[in-house]
């Protein structure tokens, strides 16, 4: 696959991953109460996210409440907010770096410098995926740990929400996309011999006797 194709595929994956990360960040479904038995009239599901919590009645009515005070939030929510938003912003920066280093743009003159810019964009996307992975896994660990913690009553037991799965898929796309961008850049910088695939060898010298080697003749 050509370096330009790798770049385009990598960039598309990163953009989809970035969108997924924004979605995961905003959704109030990082942790959800267990699936409900809809035979119970009073049944309700609680969703909790980084910015708000929602209560969904069995009737389908949903009521959401944005968290009032930042200081009242748990450490893990505050850290998850900071890291996820940082990852989203970093992906935004990585987009411009990648576009500047792309072969189809003229922001940077073609050559090793351009390829290095493209490589930087790929590395930034890789780092962005890792950065987003930290709060997702940390949060998931807390949810699972509390689910099995006997001190936590069943009313406070949550399960992994859709936002975490979307987030994990997004980080996978960002990291795969980042790898492809790095590969595309590496094809341009690290393998200069590929630019000149045809090799020419010097003509054979005559033998000591002045005659050409017999094997050259049929």
């Amino acid at each position: 696959m050509g370096s330009a194709a790798l770049e385009i595929l990598g960039l598309v994956l990163c953009l989809v991953g970035w969108g997924g990360l924004i979605l995961a960040c905003g959704l109030p479904m990082w942790q959800v109460t267990a699936f409900l038995d809809h035979n119970i009239v009073t049944a309700q599901t609680t969703w909790k996210g980084l910015w708000m919590s929602c209560v969904v009645q069995s009737t389908g009515h949903m009521q959401c409440k944005v968290y009032d005070s930042v200081l009242a939030l748990s450490t893990e929510v505050q850290a998850a907010r900071a890291l996820t938003v940082s990852a989203v912003l970093l992906a935004f920066v990585a987009l411009f770096v990648t576009l500047a280093g792309a072969q189809c743009t003229t922001c940077v003159a073609p050559g090793p410098a351009k390829a290095r810019v493209a490589l930087t964009g790929g590395v930034l996307y890789l780092f962005c995926g890792l950065l987003a992975l930290v709060p997702l896994c940390w949060f998931a660990n807390i949810v699972v740990r509390e689910f099995y913690d006997p001190s936590v009553p069943v009313s406070q037991k949550y399960e992994l929400g859709a936002a975490l799965y979307i987030g994990w898929a997004a980080t996978a796309l960002l990291m795969v996309g980042g790898c492809l961008l790095c590969c595309g850049a590496w094809v341009c910088t690290g393998r200069p011999d590929l630019s000149f695939p045809v090799k020419y060898s010097a003509p054979r010298r005559p033998t000591a006797t002045g005659d050409y080697d017999k094997k050259n003749y049929v």
């Epitope: 109460t33 267990a34 699936f35 409900l36 038995d37 119970i40 009073t42 049944a43 006997p150 001190s151 009553p153 069943v154 009313s155 406070q156 037991k157 399960e159």
Partner: antibody
């Protein structure tokens, strides 16, 4: 064999701080899943849950008494503690500590009678 | 907070009779994760500490006679003593072990 025993002042004056100790044996507050609860019962009345303290240090306190209650533990000496600040005659009751199995109270102490009176 | 309401407040029965007492919660105690109802019953004999009888609505604590039967679901629960014995003279309290703060019913006094 699990046993718990509460100890305290018996009688104290209004606005003072009530300090109770729960000494237990047969289990350790360092062991995974173990907790100690505090419950009180005014004479001839029902049971009121006050607080829980767990092996990992997490505590739960009845919101109606949140500003006045403190729970702590000393696992090395097999003890749990309850402090109630600014007591008044309404706090007169028998105070129990109980071993927790999740949110169940499966072993109870004999209780200590506390009277708040001037 | 979940409010627990017990009825009747007292009940007089003769030995050998069947007795039932009711406990209602202000919200469902059914946890959909395991389809279990988080309600317990305690017995407190005169001058003694409470003793856990039944948890998860119908599971008897070890050593509890099988004449004690718990039933119910959602918000309505019942404790039945199939054949009352003289030693069953006590106060009976229901408790939700579904959420904090843990709350008890006001109790049913069983008089023989």
């Amino acid at each position: 064999q699990v046993t718990l025993k509460e100890s305290g002042p018996g009688i104290l004056q209004p606005s003072h701080t009530l300090s109770l100790t729960c000494s237990f044996s047969g289990f350790s507050l360092n062991t995974y899943g173990v907790g100690v609860n505090w419950i009180r019962q005014p004479s001839g009345k029902g049971l009121e849950w006050l607080a829980s303290i767990w092996w990992h240090g997490k505590t739960y306190i009845n919101p109606s008494l949140k500003n006045r209650l403190t729970v702590s533990k000393d696992p090395s000496n097999n003890q749990a503690f309850l402090e109630v600040t600014n007591v008044d005659p309404a706090d007169t009751a028998t105070y129990y500590c109980a071993h927790a199995r999740a949110q169940l109270l499966d072993y109870w102490g004999q209780g200590v009678m506390v009277t708040v009176s001037s | 907070d979940i409010v627990m309401t017990q009825t009747p407040s007292s009940q007089a029965v003769s030995a050998g009779e069947k007795v039932t007492m009711s406990c209602k919660s202000s919200q469902s105690l059914l946890y959909s994760g395991d389809q279990k109802n988080y309600l317990a019953w305690y017995q407190q004999k005169p001058g003694q500490s409470p003793k856990l009888l039944i948890y998860l609505t119908s599971t008897r604590e070890s050593g509890v006679p099988d004449r004690f039967i718990g039933s119910g679901s959602g918000t309505d629960f019942t404790l039945t003593i199939s054949s009352v014995q003289a030693e069953d003279l006590a106060d009976y309290y229901c408790q939700q072990h579904y959420s904090y703060p843990l709350t008890f019913g006001s109790g049913t006094k069983l008089e023989i």
